[in-house]
């Protein structure tokens, strides 16, 4: 089965509250072509949430995903 093409995602605003870490499944950084930098978290219910890459909790979650077992 084939996936349809997906446009590049950009963040125009960031979540105003910290997402519980156990809600997070994966992440990606937005393209340099976007007007704002962003980290998009993919939640365990398959929703996408924009977060500010300069925030400490965002950096921690990204690091933990990269270093997980």
């Amino acid at each position: 089965s084939l996936a349809a093409d997906t446009p590049t995602a950009c963040c125009f605003s960031y979540t105003s509250r910290q997402i519980p870490q156990n809600f997070i499944a994966d992440y990606f950084e937005t393209s340099s072509q976007c007007s704002k930098p962003g980290v998009i978290f993919l939640t365990k219910r398959s929703r996408q949430v924009c977060a500010d890459p300069s925030e400490e909790w965002v950096q921690k979650y990204v690091s933990d995903l990269e270093l997980s077992a």
Partner: nanobody, 114 residues
Framework: EVQLVESGGGLVQPGGSLRLSCAAS???????MGWYRQAPGNEREFVAR???????NYEDSVKGRFTISQDNAKNTVYLQMDSLKPEDTASYVC?????????WGQGTQVTVSS
């Protein structure tokens, strides 16, 4: 830009095993791949993921029973599912993250029943 082809689903008895595959094709670098599942009437839920560097994460309900692995050269991810239970019955949907987006497959059906 990215196409995902899933295979390996089917009907299996409780306690049995299946191995799902998801092959990604396209011209972009894949950062991570993984699986969600969706049973009829339920929300899509996370199963497992693996990063290009080999980092893995699992949903608690599948830890110790499911194993995710990858072949980076083939841009393919595998989900080995052992000790299957009736509650594992669902459509298993592969995803890949790359090129600043999440790309989804169409899903492969897994039915666990005696």
């Amino acid at each position: 830009e990215v196409q995902l082809v899933e295979s390996g689903g089917g009907l299996v008895q409780p306690g049995g095993s299946l191995r799902l595959s998801c092959a990604a094709s396209g011209s972009i670098f894949i950062n991570s791949m993984g699986w969600y599942r969706q049973a009829p009437g339920n929300e899509r839920e996370f199963v497992a993921r693996i990063s290009s560097g080999g980092s893995t994460n699992y949903e608690d309900s599948v830890k110790g029973r499911f194993t995710i692995s990858q072949d980076n050269a083939k841009n393919t991810v595998y989900l080995q599912m052992d000790s299957l239970k009736p509650e594992d019955t669902a459509s298993y949907v592969c995803y890949a993250i790359g090129g600043g987006a999440v790309h989804w497959g169409q899903g492969t059906q897994v039915t666990v029943s005696s």
